[in-house]
């Protein structure tokens, strides 16, 4: 049994890091493998992650971490029984994929203005809380070409757009994702999408 693709990990910079790797053949990840991880820190304890299958030869492990900070560095040991298959390290702050925003809501009752709001996925005491920027994707269910991205570079998790910038009388969907420049993160996954019917009064022409 050998590792074909070494583990690569990403952290949500809060409580979970996800590591994925591939074996050289079909593997029952949860019964045959264990990923041991330990913070390189005084008094830290070793933890064991039981991987799940991710395709025939692929495995994925969700590592639970407390109080993630930029100085953290973890040792990783991948075991198959008594055999050490791979040894490596992982610094969560250098491989951050933020959590997806939640609770995306479209408020349509504000005088021909659409107000989209969502929730910051981090608590206020997490460093990323004040450093996320967002991308909002709006698209028409009727017209695949009607697809737009709004970059939200301010901290407030909201976006206002004129309803008239979208077509009236049809349904739209929106979703939002986040990233943080400070840690050069990847984009988060998209939030679940929300749907609304866009209607507004055409301005009366003289």
């Amino acid at each position: 049994m050998k590792v074909l693709q070494e583990p690569t990990c990403v952290s949500d910079y809060m409580s979970i890091s996800t590591c994925e790797w591939k074996m050289n053949g079909p593997t029952n990840c949860s019964t045959e493998l264990r990923l041991l991880y330990q913070l390189v820190f005084l008094l830290s304890e070793a933890h064991t992650c039981i991987p799940e299958n991710n395709g025939g030869a692929g495995c994925v492990c969700h590592l639970l971490m407390d109080d993630v900070v930029s100085a953290d560095n973890y040792t990783l040991d991948l075991w198959a029984g008594q055999q050490l298959l791979w040894k490596g390290s992982f610094k969560p702050s250098e491989h951050v994929k933020p959590r997806a925003p939640g609770n995306l809501t479209v408020h349509t009752n504000v005088s021909d203005t659409l107000l989209l709001t969502w929730s910051n996925p981090y608590p206020p005491d997490n460093y990323l809380y004040n450093h996320l920027t967002y991308a909002v994707n709006i698209w028409s269910e009727n017209d695949p070409a009607d697809f737009r991205i709004y970059n939200v570079t301010y901290l407030e998790p909201s976006l206002r757009i004129a309803a008239s910038t979208l077509k009236s009388g049809i349904s739209y969907r929106a979703r939002v994702r986040a990233w943080a420049q400070c840690y050069n993160t990847t984009w988060s996954e998209w939030s679940p999408s929300t749907k609304w019917h866009n209607s507004y009064r055409e301005p009366f022409e003289q």
């Epitope: 820190f41 005084l42 008094l43 830290s44 304890e45 407390d66 109080d67 900070v69 930029s70 100085a71 005491d125």
Partner: antibody, heavy 116, light 111 residues
Framework: QVQLVQSGAEVKKPGASVKVSCKAS????????MHWARQAPGQGLEWMGI????????SYAQKFQGRVTMTRDTSTSTVYMELSSLRSEDTAVYYC?????????WGKGTLVTVSS | QSVLTQPPSVSAAPGQKVTISCSGG????????VSWYQQLPGTAPKLLIY???KRPSGIPDRFSGSKSGTSATLAITGLQTGDEADYYC????????????FGTGTKLTVL
């Protein structure tokens, strides 16, 4: 919000021991290390040691080795710092502080006076 | 035990900028991150800066930190009378043993 509530002031005689408590609330107690530091009157801060509330393991500053004991009670989310063989130089305000590489939150401090 | 050296005192007028230095060795500041704490008279220390230059939520951007080599600096701009306090730098060292030294402390007086 995070709160670290420390026990009240103590007056002790030289040679005695003192046990200071620090009750934590507002966060997952076993997820954060706890430091102890002290500050003698008019002096600076001095680190004493650290405890991992998850397993209870400890490490102490060399200066206090053999005299200090840090423990925790997960059922009450409380950490304790006991200092023995007290001398007058141990008169200080003792602080617990939550954190790993740095101290995010501090208790208000417990004044321990050692006097004959 | 590692020693972090700070000036005993600094002073400046309201609205001015002041800097406080913190110097240590390669086994402490040189290898680690620096934090800064503010201690107002009669109160417990409070975290101002961590990770050399990051501010906890609620700390105004008048406070900033930097690190270069084996020394670090805390800068305070737009000084206010409420900033009058003792300031301590802190770090950690892992060799020969793990420890968390604090700086000697600096008394800031707002004139």
């Amino acid at each position: 919000q995070v709160q670290l509530v420390q026990s009240g002031a103590e007056v002790k005689k030289p040679g005695a021991s003192v046990k200071v408590s620090c009750k934590a609330s507002g966060y997952a107690f076993t997820s954060y290390y706890m430091h102890w530091a002290r500050q003698a009157p008019g002096q600076g801060l001095e680190w004493m040691g650290i405890i991992n509330p998850s397993g209870g393991s400890t490490s102490y500053a060399q200066k206090f080795q053999g005299r200090v004991t840090m423990t925790r009670d997960t059922s009450t989310s409380t950490v304790y710092m006991e200092l023995s063989s007290l001398r007058s130089e141990d008169t200080a305000v003792y602080y617990c502080a939550r954190g790993k590489y740095w101290m995010y939150d501090w208790g208000k401090g417990t004044l321990v006076t050692v006097s004959s | 035990q590692s020693v972090l050296t700070q000036p005993p005192s600094v002073s400046a007028a309201p609205g001015q900028k002041v800097t406080i230095s913190c110097s240590g060795g390669s086994s402490s500041i040189g290898n680690s991150y620096v934090s800064w704490y503010q201690q107002l008279p009669g109160t417990a220390p409070k975290l101002l800066i961590y990770d050399n230059n990051k501010r906890p939520s609620g700390i105004p951007d008048r406070f900033s930190g930097s690190k270069s080599g084996t020394s670090a600096t805390l800068a305070i701009t737009g000084l206010q009378t409420g900033d009058e306090a003792d300031y301590y730098c802190g770090t950690w060292a892992t060799s020969p043993v793990w420890e968390w030294p604090f700086g000697t402390g600096t008394k800031l007086t707002v004139l």
